[in-house]
Interface confidence: low
Amino acid sequence: ADTTGRAYNLTWKSTNFKTILEWEPKSIDHVYTVQISTRLENWKSKCFLTAETECDLTDEVVKDVGQTYMARVLSYPARNGNTTGFPEEPPFRNSPEFTPYLDTNLGQPTIQSFEQVGTKLNVTVQDARTLVRRNGTFLSLRAVFGKDLNYTLYYWRASSTGKKTATTNTNEFLIDVDKGENYCFSVQAVIPSRKRKQRSPESLTECTSREQGRAREMTGHHHHHH
C-alpha cells in the first residue's frame, strides 16, 4: 500500500456527459481534493477535502465537450495535529485524459412511441436530454452529437427469433413489415465514427401485440402513438 495515501485507480465514469471521477482507496486516514484542467488552463479545485472517493465533474466537462480534460486527486491527512496545517505539496495522482465527446458512454435509449399500420412500422426513439447547455437550455443527445449519432433498430416477428436490423441518423425508423404480424423490437444508440465506446446498451424490448400493449397499460406505461 502507498503510505503517502496517494489515490489510485482513477477512473472516469461518464454516461450522456454526466461525468464522475472515481478513485481508491476509501480511507479514514485521508481526505481528498480533486483538480481538473484542460491542456490550456490552470487547475481548478473541486470536491474540497472530501472523504468520498468520487467527484462529480459534470459541470466542468460540459463547458466544452470537445476539449480534452485531465484530473488529479490530491491526498491530505484526515487528522493533522501539526500546527503548520496541510502540506504545501500534497501527494497526488493524475487521471487518464478524458474527452467527453469521444469518451462519454451512450446511455440506454428509450423507445418513445411506435405504430404499426399495415405493412409499415414506425418507431421513434426518445431524444435523451444531456447536461450540456447552450444558451441556458439543456441540449438533447442528438443536438450534441449531430449526425455522428445513429440508432440501430433490432426487430423480429414475435413468433420467431430471426432478428433484422435497420439504421437511421434521425430518431425515427419507418420499416417494412408483414401485414397482420406482430413484431418485437429494441433500439441501440451508435456513434460509428468513434474508435471505442461506439454503442449504448440496447433499450428495453417493445412489441406491437395487443396483449403486451394491454399489459403495459395496466402497469401505467403508456405510449404516444403518432
Partner: antibody
C-alpha cells in the same frame, strides 16, 4: 458570434490538388457538422461534403474519389482537398456550419454560418 | 440523388408585390431537412427558413415557408428592395445533400 474564415490557393493548373482551410472563430467544432459547398460561375450551389468534430465524413458521391475533408480540433479548423482538378472545378468554394436544432421533439439541420467564399480558378 | 427543381427560374415583380417560389423534390423529403437560402451577387448564401417552415434568427416575418413531401413553397408577402436576389431550396436529409437550381427574383 461564430465566424468562418477561409483561405487557400486561388489559381491552379489542371491535375493539381485544390487545398482550402476554414477556421472557426468564436465557437467550438463539437456538436456540429462542417460542410464545403461550391458554386461554378453563374451557376447554382453544389454540396461537396461534410465532417463532424470526431472526424466522421460524408461526401457527394460525384466527387468522392477525389475529395478529402479533414478536421484539426486543436486549431479549430477544417480543410478540403480536391485532387486532379480540371476546368470544371473552377468555382467559388464556401465553408459552412451545419447546425442541428431541436424544438419540441423536432430535429432540423441547416447551414446557418458561412464563410465569405474563396474563388478557385483552374487554368493551364 | 434527390433532385430539387425550382420554379420559376426568374420572377419579375415590383416592390410591394407578393412572391411565391416553388421547390419540387424528385422524391419525398422530410420537412425537418428542407431549408431555403437567399444569395445576393458576390455574397455567401444566407439562411432564411429551416425545417420547411421556421424562420432563421433575424429574418423578417414577410418570409414564410410551407409544404411537405415533394412540394415546398417560399412566400415573400410584400417584396422590399433588399429582397431582390436568388433563392435556393436545399435538402439535407439524404446524401448527397442537394440544392435547387435557384429562382432569381428581379425588379420588374
Amino acid at each position: 458570434q461564430v465566424q468562418l474564415q477561409q483561405w487557400g490557393a486561388g489559381l491552379l493548373k489542371p491535375s493539381e490538388t485544390l487545398s482550402l482551410t476554414c477556421a472557426v472563430y468564436g465557437g467550438s467544432l463539437s456538436g456540429y457538422y462542417w460542410s464545403w459547398i461550391r458554386q461554378p460561375p453563374g451557376k447554382g450551389l453544389e454540396w461537396i461534403g461534410e465532417i463532424g468534430a470526431s472526424g466522421s465524413t460524408r461526401y457527394n458521391p460525384s466527387l468522392k474519389s477525389r475529395v478529402t475533408i479533414s478536421v484539426d480540433t486543436s486549431k479549430n479548423q477544417f480543410s478540403l482537398k480536391l485532387s486532379s482538378v480540371t476546368a470544371a472545378d473552377t468555382a467559388v468554394y464556401y465553408c459552412a456550419r451545419d447546425t442541428p436544432y431541436y424544438y419540441e421533439g423536432g430535429y432540423y439541420y441547416y447551414m446557418d454560418v458561412w464563410g465569405k467564399g474563396t474563388t478557385v480558378t483552374v487554368s493551364s | 440523388e434527390i433532385v430539387l427543381t425550382q420554379s420559376p427560374g426568374t420572377l419579375s415583380l415590383s416592390p410591394g408585390e407578393r412572391a411565391t417560389l416553388s421547390c419540387r423534390a424528385s422524391q419525398s423529403v422530410s420537412s425537418s431537412f428542407l431549408a431555403w437560402y437567399q444569395q445576393k451577387p458576390g455574397q455567401a448564401p444566407r439562411l432564411l427558413i429551416y425545417g420547411a417552415y421556421s424562420r432563421a434568427t433575424g429574418i423578417p416575418d414577410r418570409f414564410s415557408g410551407s409544404g411537405s413531401g415533394t412540394d415546398f413553397t417560399l412566400t415573400i408577402s410584400r417584396l422590399e428592395p433588399e429582397d431582390f436576389a436568388v433563392y435556393y431550396c436545399q435538402q439535407a436529409g439524404v446524401v448527397p445533400y442537394t440544392f435547387g437550381g435557384g429562382t432569381k427574383v428581379e425588379i420588374k
